[in-house]
């Protein structure tokens, strides 16, 4: 019995000099013992003895994938021909970081492409990159286990003043983007309505320029600008913001009618539609999802629905006519 019967064209495997028919005949009881799989791998067609010419397939445990040629071939001398094959982790393990750092989102495992953000307590910043992405089985950029928090120079400079300002004698004046922002400060993704473009800016520079009355600068999110839903929403919210009656300063950001400033994180968080107060004369006529019917919503409801990424078409400002 042979898994490759000689009833057709003898086959030659890649990088194999010998044809199947050229293999010497052997006793039925000889063959190859079970091979040792790579770490985190196992033999799919497991048995005690394999015939000469028989292949075994290497599979990997969940969370790992095979890299290299995943078949071993039983040779006449009772050994296995095996290429370089290993089981590589397809997920990243939660990194071990200093206790002072907070990992968001906090999970045990992260899939390829997922990112984490490291943050520090108020008044401190990460002494290095704050955003890391799972690529293959490791984090990019690599996470140093000595990574820690350092006193935010912005906080040191500002004294009792607002962000973007510094103490000058007994009064508060705007920081100079050139003179006061030579130190490291975390990256922010910022939108400039004048140039209609977004870019990554150090927090210090953004706040200093905003203080100098550059109203065209809008905070999008913490971290460098990266394509995705967060950036998309940041841009959309900037467009909606021009009609907002509420403009509440919150950390780097400004919160609008459909948002609340989180006291613990100093970030604007979208309300959920039921949390919207009916008041306000900023109304929109919209179509929800695949519905054909029109609906009048206030700016808060529109903001919360778009923030939640629910499908909604704004037909026109003001009440629906019907």
């Amino acid at each position: 019995f042979s898994i490759m019967e000689n009833n057709g064209q003898p086959c030659i495997n890649d990088d194999e000099e010998m044809k199947e028919v050229d293999l010497p005949e052997i006793e039925a009881d000889s063959g190859c013992p079970q091979p040792v799989p790579p770490e985190n791998g196992f033999i799919r067609n497991e048995k005690q003895l394999y015939l000469v010419g028989e292949d075994v397939e290497i599979s990997c445990l969940t969370g790992f994938e095979t890299v290299g040629y995943q078949y071993f071939r039983c040779l006449p001398d009772g050994t296995w021909r095996q290429g370089d094959v290993e089981c590589q982790r397809t997920e990243c393990i939660k990194p071990v970081v200093q206790e002072v750092l907070t990992i968001t989102p906090f999970q045990r495992l992260y899939r390829i492409g997922e990112s984490i953000e490291l943050t520090c307590p108020k008044g401190f910043v990460v002494a290095g990159p704050s955003r890391y992405t799972c690529q293959g089985n490791s984090w990019t950029p690599p996470i140093s286990n000595s990574l820690t928090c350092e006193k935010d120079t912005l906080t040191k400079l500002k004294g009792h003043c607002q962000l973007g300002q510094k103490q000058s004698g007994s009064e508060c004046i705007c920081m100079s983007p050139e003179e006061d922002c030579s130190h490291h400060s975390e990256d922010l993704c910022v939108f400039d309505t004048d140039s209609n473009d977004y870019f990554t800016s150090p927090a210090c520079k953004f706040l200093a320029e905003k203080c100098l009355n550059n109203q065209q600068l809008h905070f999008l999110h913490i971290g460098s600008c990266q394509d995705g839903r967060q950036l998309e929403w940041g841009l959309e919210r900037t467009r909606l913001s021009s009609n907002s009656t509420k403009k509440e300063s919150c950390g780097y950001d400004t919160c609008y009618d459909w948002e609340k400033c989180s006291a613990s994180t100093s970030k604007c968080v979208c309300l959920l539609p039921p949390q919207c107060f009916k008041g306000g004369n900023q109304l929109y006529c919209v179509k929800m999802g695949s519905s054909t019917s029109e609906k009048t919503l206030n700016i808060c409801e529109v903001g919360t629905i778009r923030c939640a990424n629910r499908k909604m078409e704004i037909l026109h400002p003001g009440k629906c006519l019907a």
């Epitope: 968001t104 989102p105 999970q107 999110h221 995705g228 839903r229 967060q230 929403w233 609340k260 989180s262 613990s264 994180t265 970030k267 968080v269 979208c270 309300l271 959920l272 539609p273 039921p274 949390q275 919207c276 107060f277 009916k278 008041g279 609906k295 923030c307 939640a308 990424n309």
Partner: antibody, heavy 118, light 112 residues
């Protein structure tokens, strides 16, 4: 001060109907979405339904869709829950709740017990 | 539906001692714009639930600052720095990141 007072519940046979009401005071009722949340005996809490300011939009949990109807009368500052085709698993204390910018269920009524049993 | 699992189910604490309750979600509560809608409620015996913490870590109006919330993704914690007799009752976590809104099964805090 925000006050939410549910009407008395009661004992209903399986398949029967009951209408709950919730009288609201201390705030402008028509300015807020409203909701019903229930709690089975010795069980956890369960969101039931939500209604927008004027009743033009309603939302229900899957298990009560088609059987329960949430409605409101802004002139009377009253929220309602019409419950039809009642089942034993609908036995619970029903709370009416109002949101705030802090949470969806920031203010709660004292609750009313509905028992579905033969 | 998102399942929230609270541990422990019962907690017995001496007044003045700290207490910690865990709430684990069957899927991440962090949405794609970076918001997490996780709340903590306390239901005192014979009363309606009252809001303690909203948006993971913000203190509800009038809530003593011995209560604090933390966590992200799927793991959340409510901490009481020093338990007082009036803190007895059932603590519930609730999520509104995914429809329908769901609550944990509750953790009963009793005084030793």
């Amino acid at each position: 001060e925000v006050q939410l007072v549910e009407s008395d519940g009661g004992l209903v046979q399986p398949g029967g109907s009951l209408k709950l009401s919730c009288a609201a005071s201390g705030f402008t009722f028509s300015d807020y979405y409203m909701a019903w949340v229930r709690q089975g005996p010795g069980k956890g809490l369960e969101w039931v339904a939500t209604i927008n300011y004027d009743g033009s939009s309603t939302y229900y949990r899957e298990s009560v869709k088609g059987r329960f109807t949430i409605s409101r009368d802004n002139a009377k500052n009253t929220l309602y829950l019409q419950m039809n085709s009642l089942r034993a698993e609908d036995t619970a204390t029903y709370y009416c709740a109002r949101p705030s910018t802090e949470a969806l269920f920031a203010y709660w009524g004292h609750g009313t017990l509905v028992t579905v049993s033969s | 539906d998102v399942v929230l699992t609270q541990t422990p189910s019962t907690l017995s604490v001496t007044p003045g001692q700290p207490a910690s309750i865990s709430c684990r979600s069957s899927q991440s509560l962090l949405n794609d714009v970076g918001n997490t809608y996780l709340y903590w409620y306390l239901q005192k015996p014979g009363q309606s639930p009252q809001l303690l913490i909203y948006l993971v870590s913000d203190l509800g109006s009038g809530v003593p600052n011995r209560f604090s919330g933390s966590g992200s993704g799927t793991d959340f914690t409510l901490k009481i720095s020093r338990v007082e007799a009036e803190d007895v009752g059932i603590y519930y976590c609730m999520q509104a990141s995914h429809a329908p809104y769901t609550f944990g099964q509750g953790t009963n805090l009793e005084i030793k």
